[in-house]
């Protein structure tokens, strides 16, 4: 059988080889398509409800005014010329429809390095056969399930036209220190050969590199946190992040009921001020981050350093916030 590829909605003429060019003709066409069960016979004298789909022209050719999906199948003509010689023609008809240019919808303008991000959804509408969607990064094909690339695909068929809508959602995990403006595009490859791919307009999201959080530093004055009774201790919370986060203070793991401040002053230290102190920096984008804990202790006269003794009561004594 001769393979014929026809575009949906377009006319198609199939020649009946060996048929006399004009009536009277001894010929018949037989169709086995999505519109028939087994074979449907059409003759030149025909003329009827099938004419909207296929009719025999005066020259014996079969004319399909607007090919549809249901016209895929086998078409055979059997003709006898004036001398009684029989000729058979056999066609295998396949149909196709090229969709509109694919589009990337819900595209991200910014991606975050090191974490999975949805880049966008590629949509192609009105293809037959279904065909495929593929993604490209800087012009090179992206392979799903490799190097942080994942693709979620969906195929739907229109209940009336039978044409396909394809959707492909791309997720990527950009490498840290990679291209700050990668170029993504998507292309539709038809299900039938000899038709070139259709490509979307590219998108270029920015890649945002999250700055690794530097540690919250807690600086104690005097160094070591050991002070004579009645002395003063100054705790300073240093956070490199911009904008400056809110700083709260903890003592022995319990938040101190004080307004936020980067400096905590403990004047006139008494036993009740002894304990373990830390600060908590709260960033709007990252959440809370706690410093190391430092131990504040009282040195009795004649001692060299912090006592190994017990922590005093939980009384706050007199605190000053700078």
């Amino acid at each position: 059988a001769q393979n014929i590829t026809a575009r949906i909605g377009e006319p198609l003429v199939l020649k009946c080889k060996g048929a006399p060019k004009k009536p009277p003709q001894r010929l018949e066409w037989k169709l086995n398509t999505g519109r028939t069960e087994a074979w449907k016979v059409l003759s030149p004298q025909g003329g009827g409800p099938w004419d909207s789909v296929a009719r025999v022209l005066p020259n014996g050719s079969l004319f399909l005014p607007a090919v549809g999906i249901q016209d895929e199948g086998i078409f055979r003509c059997q003709a006898m010329n004036r001398n009684g010689k029989e000729t058979k023609s056999n066609y295998r008809v396949r149909v196709y429809q090229i969709p509109g240019k694919p589009e990337i919808v819900d595209s991200a303008s910014e991606l975050t390095a090191g974490v999975p991000n949805k880049v966008g959804t590629c949509v192609s509408e009105g293809s037959y056969p279904a065909g495929t969607l593929s993604w490209h990064l800087d012009g090179k094909p992206l392979v799903p399930n490799e190097k942080g690339v994942s693709v979620k695909e969906q195929t739907r068929r229109h209940p009336e036209t039978g044409l396909f809508t394809l959707q492909s959602e791309l997720m990527v995990t950009p490498a840290r220190g990679g291209d700050p403006r990668p170029t993504f595009s998507c292309s539709f490859s038809p299900g039938l050969p000899r038709h070139r791919a259709l490509r979307t307009a590219p998108i270029q999201p920015r890649v945002w590199e999250p700055v690794p959080l530097e540690e919250v530093q807690l600086v104690v004055e005097p160094e070591g946190g050991a002070v004579a009774p009645g002395g003063t201790v100054t705790l300073t919370c240093e956070v490199p992040a911009q904008p400056s986060p809110q700083i709260h203070w903890m003592k022995d793991g319990v938040p101190l009921p004080l307004p936020p401040s980067p400096v905590l002053i403990l004047p006139e230290i008494g036993p009740q001020d002894q304990g373990t102190y830390s600060c908590v920096a709260t960033h709007s984008s990252h959440g809370p981050q706690e410093s190391r804990a430092v131990s504040i202790s009282i040195i009795e006269p004649g001692e060299e350093g912090p006592t190994a003794g017990s922590v005093g009561g939980s009384g706050l004594g007199t605190l000053a916030l700078a």
């Epitope: 519109r35 028939t36 069960e37 003329g47 009827g48 409800p49 099938w50 004419d51 909207s52 789909v53």
Partner: antibody, heavy 119, light 107 residues
Framework: EVQLVESGGGLVQPGGSLRLSCAAS????????MTWVRQAPGKGLEWVAS????????YYPDSVKDRFTISRDNAKNSLYLQMNSLRAEDTAVYYC????????????WGQGTLVTVSS | DIQMTQSPSSLSASVGDRVTITCRAS??????VNWFQQKPGKAPRRLIY???NLADGVPSRFSGSRSGTDFTLTISSLQPEDFATYYC?????????FGGGTKVEIK
């Protein structure tokens, strides 16, 4: 919504002529074949004529061939049936219907118009 | 020409009954048969198209089936509004041919 409205029926003498019209709305008229079907009083349905969407091809049963002519004006969304040499047996309600080919066959009908052929 | 032989020409049934109407084509018409319902003084309404497909807005108690050249319309549970005349139509070839009709009456 699809609507088909027939008009032009009435009383006519044997041998006379009548022209029926069908005004179509609610769909793309030139995409569809159109058909006339009739029903004699107390009888069944009988196909009268069909026309393809372009108007180039027309189809009739032997009972009306050479007497009736189906036509259409796609610009006016209108279907017509010109009936000549009318006989008593042509007395019927005439319906216009959408379709008539194997793709769409008589999915919507008008309410009908009565033609009476009598002396 | 194709003949469509419809049977029975009339039947009496009660609400809730299962009703079956048959049309036999004199030659192969493929799937190209429709079923219509007509009430007195009204235009026909398509119920089933291409032998087995339920037309839009038609209750699911109506169904169509095909076995070769035999076509059947079934009403699974007859309702008061179903008392009417039913016709089959062959549209595979010209002349388009209707069955003679089946009048469904109240028992």
């Amino acid at each position: 919504e699809v609507q088909l409205v027939e008009s032009g029926g009435g009383l006519v003498q044997p041998g006379g002529s009548l022209r029926l019209s069908c005004a179509a709305s609610g769909f793309t008229f030139n995409n569809y074949w159109m058909t006339w079907v009739r029903q004699a009083p107390g009888k069944g349905l009988e196909w009268v004529a069909s026309i393809d969407n372009s108007g180039d091809n027309t189809y009739y049963p032997d009972s009306v061939k050479d007497r009736f002519t189906i036509s259409r004006d796609n610009a006016k969304n209108s279907l017509y049936l010109q009936m000549n040499s009318l006989r008593a047996e042509d007395t019927a309600v005439y319906y216009c219907a959408r379709g008539g080919d194997i793709i769409i066959s008589l999915d919507w009908w008008g309410q009908g118009t009565l033609v009476t052929v009598s002396s | 020409d194709i003949q469509m032989t419809q049977s029975p020409s009339s039947l009496s049934a009660s609400v809730g009954d299962r009703v079956t109407i048959t049309c036999r084509a004199s030659q192969d018409v493929g799937i190209y048969v429709n079923w219509f319902q007509q009430k007195p003084g009204k235009a026909p309404r398509r119920l089933i198209y291409r032998a087995t497909n339920l037309a839009d807005g038609v209750p699911s108690r109506f169904s169509g089936s095909r076995s070769g050249t035999d076509f059947t319309l079934t009403i699974s549970s007859l309702q008061p509004e179903d008392f009417a005349t039913y016709y089959c139509l062959e549209f595979d070839e010209h002349p388009l041919t209707f069955g003679g009709g089946t009048k469904v009456e109240i028992k």
